[in-house]
């Protein structure tokens, strides 16, 4: 029978007695920055080329015994997980190894930087097909390591890294915190976060997704036919590097943004028990376990979106938080969230020629998050339309007035400290899909986009009194682009998208003493692209 | 993931650029910053990555490294350039005393300096 981890990442249509998905990543080269490896192991022999790159610190301790099998243990196992003959994910992928970790598994930021530079120079000297770089290592937050990863990613390289094994916020570690890197946490056979003694997998908004990372069978450096089981976020990252190699082999022109969106889209959703994560990290941590797409081609018609959370703003009165999309993604909507409920909304604004999502803290608030909905929308032309506070009327309204532009998201921002003291507007009238409505004392921002074949519709779900959470989901074939709450009163903590569901959180009525007239409605904007669907049908 | 204005933990030592008798003094009022690992046990003091501004050419990186060595020598400090970066980031890796950080931050083209630190297999 196939190992649990390979079964977990395989869609049912490929599940037979053995793991044999089509095309094992043969067009892709995977670089591994790790310990030395045993390249003559049967699992990886002929598949891994050991480069002459080596930059490692001296081993700790005066009596350290350098045993080849121990020195090679970590790297050999990971090479096997990525492309091993029997227990590998992408059996056709070729690999190149760089030694940046010593026999004790320790390296330096500077050694890793020089390794990344080596890869970039190799790429320039001898351009090949798609490149995946696996970084199964972590150190403290490093501005320079993150910057180097950003440069390499912008040169077209896909970087995959371990989230870290510290049972901590991955944003405090590098390269896990680099936005351009695909950061992978670890789950076990029960789809639970991996525990490693007191420690365990990292979590939080810097993690992109999880993958199998406990009791993973792979090549052992003890002998050329030996196998061993190892655990950690390195093993999880190796799975995603393998999946990425297979996706890129099937579609070599995929950009990093397209690949990341596909990894998220094809992941198993909502299977991780979030109770394992600290309470304040649960909403920020993606509940996604990586899997291969059900078919190697034909996902192009999908409108792919993902949710990007900002760093926490901090508690100061004028504090703001900014969420950004990747360079080739479109910001289609912007929302905000505060655990205390004290916030002054959010707005989309231009920064460096690109739209960003900015959330505003309020006086007495513990801080806010900005939440961006980042989508792949080729040939899109998006703009933000703003209406200042209406003051006198029932509410502020703004719509998309340009020909061919559709509404993809609504945001509202207010200067008054507490909207809850002002009478909220009635629920907005139906049948006006291109219009955002909000509180009369708030300015309202509509995200309006023109893209070939783009169509959107508004879905709402309201309940008479706040009960902690209201949700509304887009149906099959439609993608959630916008998520907001009506009305924007103080008992609403905020709104955010989880996969294809719009979640509006509010304080429980029992704790706020609110009246039933203060209904809370979750407003989802669901879109699809007829153009992308047609284009993909023409290919088939 | 972590944005540039994120809330990461680090020590940032910002020092005003001064002429310090340099031929190519940095633009007035620019600030080079010093960064180090927030986890003390993982710090590797004595080795520093000097990152130069984005459009800096390799020849300027080498010149800046040599200038640092010369100025350090005048103050009686020995330094060693371990690597000159180009291709991804412009800059260089230097082994030197932490006493020289103030001097290094005032060099032309310097964007920031980061103390080396450990990374670990996960």
């Amino acid at each position: 029978s196939i190992p649990w981890n390979l079964e977990r990442i395989t869609p049912p249509r490929y599940r037979a007695d053995e793991y044999q998905p089509p095309d094992g990543g043969s067009l892709v080269e995977v670089y591994l920055l790790d310990t030395s490896i045993q390249s003559d192991h049967r699992e990886i022999e002929g598949r891994v080329m050991v480069t002459d790159f080596e930059n490692v610190p001296e081993e700790d301790g005066t009596r350290f015994h350098r045993q080849a099998s121990k020195c090679d243990s970590h790297g050999t196992h990971l090479a096997g997980v990525v492309s091993g003959r029997d227990a590998g994910v992408a059996k056709g992928a070729s690999m190149r190894s760089l030694r940046v970790l010593n026999c004790q598994g320790k390296g330096t930021v500077s050694g890793t930087l020089i390794g990344l530079e080596f890869i970039r120079k190799s790429q320039l000297v001898q351009p090949v097909g798609p490149l995946v770089v696996l970084l199964p290592l972590a150190g403290g937050y490093s501005r320079v390591l993150n910057a180097a990863c950003q440069r390499l990613a912008r040169a077209g390289v896909v970087l995959v890294t371990a989230a870290g094994n510290f049972r901590d916020d991955a944003c405090l570690y590098s390269p896990a915190s680099a936005p351009e890197v695909i950061t992978v946490g670890a789950t076990n056979a029960q789809d639970q976060p991996v525990t490693l003694g007191t420690l365990g997998t990292n979590f939080g908004r810097c993690v992109d997704l999880f993958a199998p990372g406990e009791d993973i069978i792979g090549a052992s450096s003890d002998c050329s036919t030996c196998f061993v089981s190892q655990s950690g976020t390195s093993q999880a990252a190796a799975h995603v590097a393998g999946i990425a190699a297979m996706m890129l082999s099937a579609e070599p022109e995929l950009t990093l943004a397209e690949l990341r969106q596909r990894l998220i889209h094809f992941s198993a959703k909502d299977v991780i028990n979030e109770a394992w994560f600290p309470e304040d990290q649960r909403v920020l941590t993606p509940n996604l376990v990586a899997a291969l797409p059900p078919s190697t081609h034909g996902a192009g018609w999908q409108l792919f979106c993902r949710t990007v959370w900002s760093a926490h703003s901090g508690p100061t009165r004028m504090a703001t938080a900014i969420a950004r999309c990747a360079p080739d993604e479109e910001l289609l909507s912007c929302s905000s969230f505060s655990r205390s409920g004290k916030r002054r909304g959010e707005r989309m604004e231009a920064q460096g020629g690109k739209l960003v999502c900015r959330a505003h803290n309020a006086f007495g608030g513990e801080g806010v998050y900005a939440i961006a909905r980042c989508c792949l929308l080729p040939q899109a032309n998006c703009s933000v339309h703003t209406a200042p506070p209406a003051e006198a009327s029932m509410g502020t309204r703004v719509h998309c007035h340009q020909q061919g532009h559709v509404l993809t998201g609504c945001s509202s921002h207010w200067e008054v400290e507490d909207l809850g003291t002002h009478k909220p507007p009635v629920l907005r009238p139906r049948g006006q899909p291109n219009q955002c409505v909000g509180h009369r004392e708030a300015s309202i921002h509509a995200s309006c986009c023109h893209a070939p074949g783009l169509e959107c519709k508004v879905k709402e779900h309201g309940i008479p009194a706040p009960q902690g959470q209201v949700t509304v989901a887009c149906e099959e074939g439609w993608t959630l682009t916008g998520c907001s709450a009506l009305p924007g009163t103080s008992h609403v903590l905020g709104a955010y998208a989880v996969d294809n569901t719009c979640v509006v959180r509010s304080r429980d009525v029992s704790t706020t003493g609110s009246t039933s007239e203060e209904a809370v409605t979750a407003v989802a904007i669901c879109c699809r692209s007829r153009h992308l669907a047609q284009a993909s049908q023409e290919l088939q | 993931q972590e944005d540039e204005d994120g809330d990461y933990e680090e020590l940032v030592l910002a020092l005003r650029s001064e002429e310090d008798g340099l031929a190519e003094a940095p633009e007035h009022g620019t600030t080079a910053t010093f960064h180090r690992c927030a986890k003390d046990p993982w710090r590797l003091p004595g080795t520093y990555v000097v990152v130069l501004k984005e459009e800096t050419h390799l020849s300027q990186s080498e010149r800046t490294a040599r200038r640092l060595q010369a100025q350090a020598a005048r103050r009686g400090y020995l330094t060693k350039i371990l690597h000159v970066f180009h291709g991804l980031l412009p800059g260089f890796l230097v082994k030197m005393s932490g006493d020289l950080l103030e001097l290094a931050l005032k060099l032309p083209h310097v964007d920031y300096i980061e103390e080396d630190s450990s990374v670990f297999a996960q």
């Epitope: 490693l196 007191t198 | 046990p41």
Partner: antibody, heavy 122, light 110 residues
């Protein structure tokens, strides 16, 4: 569940030897560093020795260096402490304890055994 | 002779807060992770805090840790009778190449 059970303690004369064992269960023994810690009657905790998860590195307190040897057998999930040339001041309860992680051995100890008593007396 | 110094004892009434200091040097607390251990009478020590301020699962948030320079502090709020125990700080010492414990502090609930 995670458990450490020490054995091998007893009364021994000064200058003689004793070998302590610690049987581990409920976790992947080979993934963790292991410590021995002792506590003399009415006194505080004193660290004795540490061995890395793969046995590649060993560290000892100055007070036992050259007399005590820490070792492990990962196939048997067992940690050992060979104590030679025992002295009266080695009298204590000896605990084995698991290091919080393999590579970050200096993080401390998260799982402790109940201890075994060693009395060195003539 | 321990290289980490703690006060021999601290006491407070139930519900009150106590803090225990642990003073060291740059070779230990200054540049290494600090852990705190609780030893109830007649039992083995138990990990309370690691990496200066992180709690293992199952340790209530009444226990907190912090570090400043070459000193570390354990805080216990909402003191309960069950908190009566000896408390030890511990860290690696780079110059000794070994782990060191503090002298220990007995907490008494009045």
């Amino acid at each position: 569940q995670v458990q450490l059970v020490e054995s091998g303690g007893g009364v021994v004369q000064p200058g003689r030897s004793l070998r302590l064992s610690c049987a581990a269960s409920g976790f992947t023994f080979s993934s963790f560093g292991m410590h021995w810690v002792r506590q003399a009657p009415g006194k505080g905790l004193e660290w004795v020795a540490l061995i890395w998860n793969d046995g590649s590195n060993k560290y000892y307190a100055d007070s036992v260096k050259g007399r005590f040897t820490i070792s492990r057998d990962n196939s048997k999930n067992t940690l050992y402490l060979q104590m030679n040339s025992l002295r009266a001041e080695d009298t204590a309860v000896y605990y084995c304890a698991r290091a919080i992680a393999a590579l970050y051995y200096y993080y401390g100890m998260d799982v402790w055994g109940h201890g075994t008593t060693v009395t060195v007396s003539s | 002779q321990s290289v980490l110094t703690q006060p021999p004892s601290v006491s407070a009434a139930p519900g009150q807060k106590v803090t225990i200091s642990c003073s060291g040097s740059s070779s230990n607390i200054g540049n290494n992770f600090v852990s705190w251990y609780q030893q109830l009478p007649g039992t083995a020590p138990k990990l309370l805090i690691y990496d200066y301020n992180k709690r293992p699962s199952g340790i209530p948030d009444r226990f907190s840790g912090s570090k400043s320079g070459t000193s570390a502090t354990l805080g216990i709020t909402g003191l309960q009778t069950g908190d009566e125990a000896d408390y030890y700080c511990g860290t690696w010492d780079s110059s000794l190449s070994g782990y060191v414990f503090g002298t220990g502090t007995r907490v008494t609930v009045l």
